[in-house]
């Protein structure tokens, strides 16, 4: 067999509402997946598990199955969506992303994804990780790529 | 020049209320939130609270709940804390407290980056 | 809570030394550390935020290290004025919580 490539190529928008009570932030995140079969049967995408973390804590999960069937030598892309909340302990962010004298609301996010292919009842696992930037302050497309993470730092002005 | 002006010493009787009020000058005062946060005598700093000036929105210290209330006067830029039901055990220095977020293209952090003269506040019969 | 255990309490130095402060956060809290100075009869004063960005009018002689759980506050080159109270603070997560202080006297 020759190799599945999985290809996390960033975020694709991410939708954000507030809790002003409970001082919590929602922000949907959809992010998008090349997967390359470079084999010469088809496989199948059993299922894809993301979970996104802010500040090594663990803010959103997502679990999608029985995705799609990738043909011979094909490749498709897969955008999937993960629910998350900013809240309790970290409800110090709701200024961050709401205060109007703050003029960039980015926050960075690690995004995990792990990808279950199957073929001829043989499962693999692939994973990804990476850091992507997501303006907690209102809702935004992306252009794809365009979220990858760098980093400079200024006090609020 | 940023100032956060604090009120005078307080002497006040076991089961009495207090209100410390906390100037702010010399900044828009809805650019930033306010952190109170208590020095017990010979002792380290404790965070109360924090409010938002926008909304008044506020998120409290567990073991101040039901103890502080955080409240603000956006007409006269000021910061208000209220200690009720108050024992010997809250006689401290009580401090309000600039908070800023640090930024570049993303959320880098926060600090207290100015702080009230702090406000004694003393419970005896 | 996050607990920071912050060492030592006490400190004796001359003017022209070199001193470390050090704190130690009871779960790993990125590098969301604030560093502060109390004296008597002035405001409390920012010296570091965000681990180890100095700032602004603070002079270079302070300077912080560290992350996860593991942080420092270095003094080269003591100045008369550098004798007072030092504090870290974590801002990870809700409640903020501050170490016990290190109070730094002139030997």
């Known amino acids: 067999p020759r190799s599945i490539d999985v290809k996390y190529i960033g975020v694709k928008s991410a939708y954000v509402s507030y809790d002003v009570q409970k001082r919590t932030i929602y922000l949907n995140i959809t992010n998008t997946l090349n997967i390359t079969n470079n084999n010469y049967y088809s496989v199948e995408v059993e299922n894809i598990t993301a979970q996104v973390q802010f500040s090594k804590t663990v803010i959103g999960k997502a679990r999608l199955n029985n995705i799609t069937i990738i043909g011979p030598l094909d490749m498709k892309q897969i955008d999937y969506t993960v629910p998350t909340v900013i809240a309790e302990e970290m409800s110090y962010m709701y200024d961050f992303c709401t205060l109007i004298s703050i003029k960039v609301h980015n926050i960075v996010l690690m995004m995990q994804v792990t990808v279950t292919t199957t073929y001829f009842g043989h499962s693999e696992q692939i994973s990804q990780e990476r850091y992507q930037y997501v303006d907690c302050g209102r809702n935004t497309t992306y252009q794809l790529g365009q979220s990858e993470y760098l980093n400079v730092l200024q006090p609020q002005q | 020049e940023v100032q956060l002006q604090q009120s005078g010493p307080e002497l006040v009787k076991p089961g009495a209320s207090v209100k410390i009020p906390c100037k702010a000058s010399?900044?828009?005062?809805?650019?930033?939130?306010m952190d109170w946060v208590k020095q017990s005598p010979g002792k380290s700093l404790e965070w109360i609270g924090h409010?938002?000036?926008?909304?008044?929105?506020?998120f409290y210290n567990q073991k101040f709940k039901g103890k502080a209330t955080l409240t603000v006067d956006k007409s006269s830029s000021t910061a208000y804390m209220e200690l009720r039901s108050l024992t010997s055990e809250d006689s401290a220095v009580y401090y309000c407290a600039r908070w800023v977020y640090y930024y570049g293209i993303s959320y880098e952090g926060g600090a207290m980056d100015y702080w009230g003269q702090g406000t004694s506040v003393t419970v005896s019969s | 809570d996050v607990q920071i255990t912050q060492s030592p309490s006490y400190l004796a130095a001359s003017p022209g030394e070199t001193i470390t402060i050090n704190c130690r956060a009871s779960k790993s809290i990125s590098k969301y550390l604030a560093w502060y100075q109390e004296k008597p009869g002035k405001t409390n004063k920012l010296l570091i935020y965000?681990?180890?960005t100095l700032q602004s009018g603070i002079p270079s002689r302070f300077s912080g290290s560290g992350s996860g759980t593991d942080f420092t506050l270095t003094i080269s080159s003591l100045e008369p004025e550098d004798f007072a109270m030092y504090y870290c603070q974590q801002h990870n997560e809700y409640p903020w919580t501050f170490g016990g202080g290190t109070k730094l006297e002139i030997k």
């Open positions: 965000s681990g180890s």
């Open positions: 409010i938002n000036p926008n909304d008044g929105g506020t």
């Open positions: 010399g900044y828009t005062f809805t650019d930033y939130t």
